[in-house]
């Protein structure tokens, strides 16, 4: 069944429900300059052609100017994320102008009507920007439009309609319905600003994708594959509210884009890095942890401007809450012999031991299958900074954890009742840190003992020679 959307029911219902009769709606867009960090402050309303509020409210013509653009609303009130974002921008950029684009009356409609209103709202923002450009010292290059959901496409229209080019547009989980696959002039696209960066947190290949799946910026970042966000599962939501609903999960995942952006503003010292990759599966395999040729970038506010000829899809893993940063590791395990493997894939776990801390027991996700006489690549990530890695414990889980594996094992036993013990031989594990780009090789503690079987473990220590490959010794990412 389709994914429900919002506390008032399914998005599909909203698309076709007849409009309730109401007072005549002014097609109004308001620009609220948030003059105080106090969220209760009413701020200053700016309007084209009226210069007095700019003076009265100390609009800084030479500073950065942020326009925050909300999305579709079912309640007609600002959602709570807005104040967090305003506050975070004020904290990070003390002299900046933070303007909230209030298009609530046009967004508090059936979804289809709100979509049809995005163009007119984009026009209003462009008119405001054109007027501001008439003022001395105001530069479009200092303008950063930040749009959430439907607001991301509003930002796209604004960037398209304005005379000149805005400095940056950030799309926070741009809306999917009615925009997926649309012409570039009818959605957010790279030509709408000098730099367009996008965070995708609620994309779905089945059912209704609330966020757009296709890349729409210069860089498109898909945290946790752009779909299932940690801390947003039904169980997590059930923990925080009395009745966990799919609606809450949808909201949590869609809104995660905002929180990742806020995190990048307030936790500058803990930047999250994303890595260029052709797709989520390849990233899950650990293949894409390179920073060569601009293949990695900070996410959110700290993203470095990249104007690629084609869209750049980037991936990362995150924690369930702020600070979202994790530490990514690529693990290359060369399996040089294989004994009586049967049909079932082994379940491996690793524990990483470092100079700062030790990791928890981490599963090695087998995306396809373990290849024999080949190097198998895995992605693991830790929530804490382990420092320099010292040793690795590799464990092959004993008893099967799934009914499916138990059945396969039983079937395997029926066909080969005297099946001797299953075994793999592994001599070394190569590890690359995504965050530092450092590479190390770990060898078995006992060179004579390289075999591992179910319920057993193997210990690896840093090999004496280490592991270096040409041209990849120095990290291209600068960490603070």
């Amino acid at each position: 069944s389709p994914v429900p959307f919002g506390p008032e029911g399914r998005l599909e219902d909203k698309l076709h429900k007849p409009k309730a009769t109401q007072t005549e709606v002014k097609p109004s867009v308001r620009f609220n300059l948030r003059t105080s960090k106090d969220p209760e402050h009413e701020g200053c309303y700016l309007s084209v052609g009226h210069s007095q509020p700019l003076e009265d409210c100390s609009f800084n013509m030479t500073a950065k100017t942020f326009f925050i653009i909300h999305g579709w609303t079912m309640s007609g009130i600002f959602e709570n994320w807005l104040h967090k974002l305003v506050s975070a921008l004020h904290t990070r950029e003390k002299d900046a102008n933070v303007v909230v684009v209030d298009w609530l009356p046009l967004a508090h409609q059936l979804y289809t009507d709100a979509v049809n209103n995005t163009r007119v709202v984009g026009h209003s923002i462009a008119r405001m920007l054109d007027w501001l450009q008439e003022k001395d010292d105001f530069s479009l290059g200092n303008v950063h439009l930040i749009g959430y959901s439907l607001g991301a496409h509003v930002a796209g229209y604004a960037g398209n309609f304005v005379k000149g080019t805005v400095g940056r547009i950030t799309g926070l989980d741009p809306a999917g319905p009615m925009f997926e696959g649309a012409d570039i002039h009818k959605r957010l696209s790279p030509d709408d600003a000098d730099f367009v960066d996008v965070l995708h947190t609620y994309t779905r290949s089945f059912g209704l994708s609330i966020g757009i799946q296709m890349p729409v910026g210069h860089i498109d970042i898909y945290p946790n594959g752009g779909d299932f966000q940690p801390g947003c599962g039904l169980n997590d939501v059930l923990g925080s509210i009395a009745y966990g609903t799919i609606t809450e999960v949808v909201k949590c995942e869609h809104e995660r884009a905002v929180h990742l952006f806020v995190d990048s503003l307030v936790n500058q010292d803990k930047p999250s890095f994303a890595f260029q990759c052709t797709d989520s599966n390849r990233f899950k395999k650990g293949i894409c942890l390179s920073c060569r040729k601009n293949r990695c970038n900070s996410i959110g506010y700290n993203a470095k401007k990249m104007r690629n000829k084609r869209n750049s899809k980037m991936y990362l893993k995150t924690r369930a809450g702020m600070p979202f940063r994790v530490y990514h590791y690529q693990m290359k395990i060369h399996v040089f012999s294989y004994k009586n493997m049967g049909e079932i894939e082994p379940t491996f776990y690793v524990t990483l031991y470092g100079t700062n801390a030790d990791s928890q027991t981490l599963p090695l996700e087998i995306v396809e299958r373990i290849e024999q006489n080949a190097t198998n690549t895995f992605l693991v990530y830790t929530e804490e900074d382990l420092g320099d890695l010292l040793k690795i414990q590799l464990t092959w889980e004993g008893a099967s954890q799934s009914w499916y594996n138990l059945w396969k094992e039983f079937r395997s036993y029926l066909s080969q009742p005297r099946n001797p013990g299953r075994e793999l031989n592994i001599r070394r594990i190569r590890v690359k840190s995504g965050e530092t780009q450092r590479k190390l090789t770990f060898c078995t503690e006992d060179p004579e003992n390289t075999s591992i079987s179910p319920g057993r473990e193997l210990w690896f220590r840093k090999c004496r020679d280490g592991w270096r490959m040409k041209n990849e010794t120095s990290p291209t990412v600068e960490l603070p």
Partner: antibody, heavy 120, light 111 residues
Amino acid sequence: QVQLVQSGSELKKPGASVKVSCKASGYTFTNYGMNWVRQAPGQGLEWMGWINTYSGVPTYAGDFKGRFVFSLDTSVSTAYLQISSLKAEDTAVYYCARRGYYGRRYFDVWGKGTTVTVSS
Amino acid sequence: DIQLTQSPSSLSASVGDRVTITCKASQSVDYDVDSYMHWYQQKPGKAPKLLIYAASNLASGVPSRFSGSGSGTDFTFTISSLQPEDIATYYCQQTIEDPPTFGGGTKVEIK
């Protein structure tokens, strides 16, 4: 100072209509939403809904859809509550209360209330 | 809708006593570090008046004997030293989402 001045008490017969006014002063009327709250005799507070004072878009709580209408006259900074087809159970004190569009949306300023009595 | 359960529904205390009222929400009314829970005082025949906003912030002009605390689903309102002019009904309210809802009220009387 900031205040909301409501119209006086009303005594109405069942089936009639009533229009309660709430005049704002001391602040920019369109910068705050206007809410309506009902309090039946001896009962608690019940939110009826609110009106966006800039756009004129009203939002009604579940039990107040149909016979209740919120409207505005921004030229005189006044919000109105109209109840049609009055019933005995509409007997209550009706309050207007403002809330900010931003922040935590509490009701920081209230009118003194208008008592509406419906009796045959 | 979020239900708010206030307790006790009424209480009688002496002047100078410490009075505590609790309000329990059917789901969390926190967003990040903010609590969208507020407290109002309504004296007989008068309109409600905001006392505490965002769980623990004293509204302008409100005496410091009034205080609030709590987060998530459990909140407390306290009068540190009850005064004769504090005879009223006190209501909690959540505004984390629309519709905003009120607790059933706690009537405070002097012994």
